[in-house]
Interface confidence: medium
């Protein structure tokens, strides 16, 4: 019953993170840029995405542009672009590969195999984690490395947008989630390990350790 | 309407100093940061000098970082620019611009001619 | 300092037709570029801010695009008053940089 309310928890983070991914995504909140100091009046805000930027004026309109074309883009704007997609399309494939090996679900009749897809689908959670991680902290250092480049205009110097935050949270509940699949799967059945071993000799190593062996660090 | 007016232009010896003033009307001046911006004869156009709208920071171009002083009288409305050291390739119309913030350079004045010649 | 290529230097176009001139940057400054248009012996004048944000009072047929080192103005179709010299300009780094400018003759 613990594996069951574990594996439960796991996947509603997960679905959570994948939530959080698709908001952060899609909204053009990356970078934040106010421009005041230098002209007090003139409280213009602009907000900056992955596909498109936002100006808020000091009236309170906004007005949202969509990116041109794709390849005149910054080749990192790509970049993130399409690893928030990959990350994405990832966590999708891995909550298939989970509903596939739920307890709850008859796609696979035997429990050892179930506890497989059930490690396999934490094993894509926890990448598409870390490529929800790699666009959000790379912009998050691009942003820190120009607001202390003395070169770089006051009224430029960008702000981590609420996007970021939202990718990290994404990342960790993604990571968080997976990891927890990762360690329900072992106790998926009545065999212990020595059974997975006999039966599955060639993916021995990924199934038979107990949760106990598995490093936790991989996991927070 | 938004109004710049530059003046205090002329002819002046290489090495001699001149002080261009720039009057603002028709906005409140104390809210806007101010450029200057000169043109050479034939030429394009070279940013010289920024300052903040309460004067408290200030940037200039590695052309005249050193010999040019940017400053403001918030009470009188102007902007001046303090020109030491003035070289021949000094020799441009100088504009005063106003510093739109997302918009930069909003309105510009007319110009003054400032020329340095021997 | 961020050095601005405009190209072509000069262009010769009609009444009605669509003209394009490129800003390239020598790096990336994000969409912090400005158009401006300067005829003879009067001051500039700003078209475009933020890469394609038209300032207020400017025609409808000026359009700005790009991001990062490559931008583009286009004059959707030529009217008698647009012919004169076009310049970018960079405002995320110091010092904030022109174009060399691009003249722009009738035919």
């Known amino acids: 019953m613990a594996s069951a309310g574990m594996q439960i928890l796991g996947v509603v983070l997960t679905l959570l993170g994948w939530v959080n991914g698709l908001v952060s995504c899609a909204l053009p909140m990356w970078k934040v840029t106010a421009f005041i100091g230098n002209s007090i009046v003139v409280a213009q805000v602009v907000w900056e995405g992955l596909w498109m930027s936002c100006v808020v004026q000091s009236t309170g309109q906004m007005q949202c542009k969509v990116y041109d074309s794709l390849l005149a883009l910054p080749q990192d704007l790509q970049a993130a672009r399409a690893l928030c997609v990959i990350a994405l399309l990832v966590a999708l494939f891995g909550l298939l590969v989970y509903l596939a090996g739920a307890k709850c679900t008859t796609c696979v009749e035997e429990k050892d195999s179930k506890a497989r897809l059930v490690l396999t689908s934490g094993i894509v959670f926890v990448i598409s984690g870390v490529l929800t991680l790699i666009p959000v902290c790379w912009t998050a250092h691009a942003i820190i490395r120009d607001f202390y480049n003395p070169l770089v205009a006051e009224a430029q110097k960008r702000e981590l947008g609420a996007s970021l935050y939202l990718g990290w949270a994404a990342s960790g509940l993604l990571l968080l989630g997976g990891g927890l699949l990762c360690c329900t799967c072992p106790s998926g059945g009545s065999q212990g390990p020595s059974h997975y071993m006999a039966r599955y000799s060639t993916s021995a190593p990924a199934i038979s350790r107990g949760p106990s062996e598995y490093p936790t660090k991989n996991y927070v | 309407q938004v109004q710049l007016v530059e003046s205090g232009g002329g002819v002046v010896q290489p090495g001699r100093s001149l002080r261009l003033s720039c009057t603002a009307s028709?906005?409140?001046?104390?809210?806007?940061?101010m450029h200057w911006v000169r043109q050479a004869p034939g030429k394009g156009l070279e940013w010289v000098s920024f300052?903040?709208?309460?004067?408290?920071?200030?940037n200039y171009a590695d052309s005249v970082k050193g010999r040019f002083t940017i400053s403001r009288d918030n009470s009188k409305n102007m902007l001046y620019l303090r020109m030491d050291s003035l070289r021949a390739e000094d020799t441009a119309v100088y504009y005063c611009?106003?510093?739109?913030?997302?918009?930069?350079?909003?309105?510009w004045g007319q110009g003054t001619l400032v020329t340095v010649s021997s | 300092a961020i050095q601005l290529t405009q190209s072509p230097s000069s262009l010769s176009a009609s009444v009605g037709d669509r003209v394009t001139i490129t800003c390239r940057a020598s790096?990336?400054?994000?969409?912090?570029l400005a158009w401006y248009q300067q005829k003879p012996e009067k001051a500039p004048k700003s078209l475009i801010y933020a890469a394609s944000s038209l300032q207020s009072g400017v025609p409808s047929r000026f359009s700005g695009s790009g991001s990062g080192t490559d931008f583009t103005l286009t004059i959707s179709s030529l009217q008698p008053e647009d012919f004169a010299t076009y310049y970018c300009?960079?405002?995320?780094?110091?010092?904030?940089?022109f174009g060399q400018g691009t003249k722009l003759e009738i035919i």
């Open positions: 300052l903040w709208f309460d004067g408290s920071k200030d």
């Open positions: 300009q960079q405002y995320n780094f110091y010092p904030y940089t």
């Open positions: 790096q990336g400054i994000n969409s912090w």
């Open positions: 028709g906005f409140t001046f104390s809210h806007y940061g």
């Open positions: 611009a106003r510093n739109g913030g997302l918009t930069i350079f909003d309105y």
